[in-house]
């Protein structure tokens, strides 16, 4: 039960994250105007992966894409690459976990199969979720920078008449929303790869034991030529979880809401 | 086609205060923000402040803080400017404008201040 | 706040004749993020509301006869009527619509000589 409830609990995390990530990628609020210097401006702007925003005094909101490929700095395209990834990996992930999980039935599929799948998933989501961090992180680090750059600009070679006040960018939300949801998505491969574990199925480590035949004094160890490494063969068909071997029956779990997509 | 129509002329006594309406038509009015902007007689423009009709969302000009008030009714579209505590020197024409770059005003209500 | 000093106050000029009326603010207009001088042109007439003659400092707004041309950037802007008609007898108002509070230049009246 414990394993199921960790599948489908790494399941919905990671696709949350997921969700998370795609929205992040798609929001336009990367940066955002630094309003400190200029509180008042009736004219804000604002810059996602995409296309960049101005929010006029009229409450108009006008945004134009990014129509060229080659004339943008590397950073922003190694940001746009890895958000990419992190989505493709995380969306292959979550088809492969549909299927993994223990309380979806798919013909006669091997739970060994299914220990696979979830692992398989759980480490896509994994990297899924540190491409995301990563993407998102190395877009803030851009900001800190020209941040900066542009305070030392700001302040200097202008004879203290600064008449243009240079546009500063700050944090924007997708960035957090990007944080949250690639740790989300981290979180979620970690369960699957934790449930994954205990979906695999184990030989039983069974003690020698010592049977005195009538007339001969000869020990035997269950399991053949394996007696050697200590585990006999698990001949009955039980599957062997963290918590003790219990038959399938036993762990039959209920559909709940999260268990078809 | 787009219409910003206001309430008719006012005559007030100093101290009390005045309620402008301006009823927007032809455009989504949730998607601009409706400003006001004053005229005295034979004087150049003012601007006082906006209203965001999709937020209630409100900004007005330093000179006019704690004087006026810019409420909205989005089931019938129309925006309002009350402005407090009146004085001679209010008396102007009042507009509410709207859309990009203040494309529409409205015609105008002018408020009379007078003992 | 953002100071707009008109000049001249008022003009007058032959029919058919150029008029220039120039804008100056105290702070540059110029918005970095795309581009734009956020200066904006209205025309008055005597008894009614302004209208968007020229907004960005030199897009003509829809319907503006192309006489009416903008320019400038940062901080010095100028409105040109090419040819002055009778109908363009109004005062001329240039607006900052880049910082609160929006300020307006005192406005140039165009009369006919």
């Known amino acids: 039960m414990a394993v199921t409830a960790c599948q489908g609990l790494g399941f919905v995390v990671s696709l949350i994250g997921i969700a998370g990530i795609i929205a992040a990628t798609c929001m336009d609020q990367w940066s955002t105007q630094d309003l400190y210097n200029n509180p008042v401006t009736a004219v804000f702007n604002y810059q996602g992966l995409w296309r960049s925003c101005v929010r006029e005094s009229s409450g108009f909101t006008e945004c134009r894409g990014y129509f060229t490929l080659l004339g943008l700095p590397a950073m922003l395209q190694a940001v746009r690459a890895l958000m990419i990834v992190g989505i493709v990996l995380g969306a292959i992930g979550l088809l492969v976990s549909i299927f993994a999980l223990k309380c979806i039935r798919i013909g006669s599929m091997e739970d060994s199969a299914k220990a696979n799948m979830t692992l398989t998933s759980g480490i896509m989501f994994i990297v899924s979720g540190l491409c995301a961090i990563a993407g998102v992180s190395v877009f803030a680090n851009m900001l800190v920078t020209n941040f900066w750059m542009s305070t030392a600009n700001m302040y200097t070679g202008m004879g203290g008449m600064v008449q243009t006040v240079q546009t500063r960018y700050t944090f924007g939300a997708a960035l957090f929303v990007g944080w949250v949801a690639g740790g989300l998505t981290l979180i979620g491969g970690v369960m699957m790869c934790i449930a994954c574990r205990g979906l695999a199925p184990e030989e039983t480590n069974y003690k020698a034991v010592s049977y005195h035949a009538s007339g001969h004094s000869v020990a035997y160890k269950p399991g053949g030529f394996k007696a050697s490494t200590g585990f006999g063969s698990n001949t009955k068909n039980k599957k062997i979880y963290d918590g003790g071997a219990r038959t399938e029956d036993e762990v039959q779990s209920y559909p709940s809401k999260h268990d078809y997509v | 086609q787009v219409q910003l129509v206001q309430s008719g002329a006012e005559v007030k006594k100093p101290g009390a205060s005045v309620k402008v309406s301006c009823k927007a038509s032809?455009?989504?009015?949730?998607?601009?923000?409706v400003h006001w902007v004053r005229q005295a007689p034979g004087q150049g423009l003012e601007w006082m402040g906006y209203?965001?009709?999709?937020?209630?969302?409100?900004k007005y000009n330093e000179k006019f803080k704690g004087r006026v008030t810019m409420t909205r009714d989005t089931s019938t579209s129309t925006v309002y400017m009350e402005l407090s505590s009146l004085r001679s020197e209010d008396t102007a024409v009042y507009y509410c404008?709207?859309?990009?770059?203040?494309?529409?005003w409205g015609q105008g209500t002018l408020v009379t201040v007078s003992s | 706040d953002i100071v707009m000093t008109q000049s001249p106050d008022s003009l007058a000029v032959s029919l058919g004749e150029r008029a220039t009326i120039s804008c100056k603010s105290s702070q540059s207009l110029l918005n970095s993020g795309n581009q734009k001088n956020y200066l904006t042109w209205y025309q008055q007439k005597p008894g009614q509301a302004p209208k968007l003659l020229i907004y960005w400092a030199s897009t003509r707004e829809s319907g503006v006869p192309d006489r009416f041309s903008g320019s400038g950037s940062g901080t010095d802007f100028t409105l040109t009527i090419s040819s002055v008609q009778a109908e363009d007898v109004a005062v001329y108002f240039c607006q900052n619509d880049y910082s609160y509070p929006l300020t307006f230049g005192g406005g140039t009246k165009v009369e006919i000589k």
């Open positions: 032809g455009y989504t009015f949730t998607n601009y923000f």
């Open positions: 404008l709207s859309l990009r770059f203040f494309a529409y």
């Open positions: 209203i965001n009709p999709y937020n209630d969302d409100t």
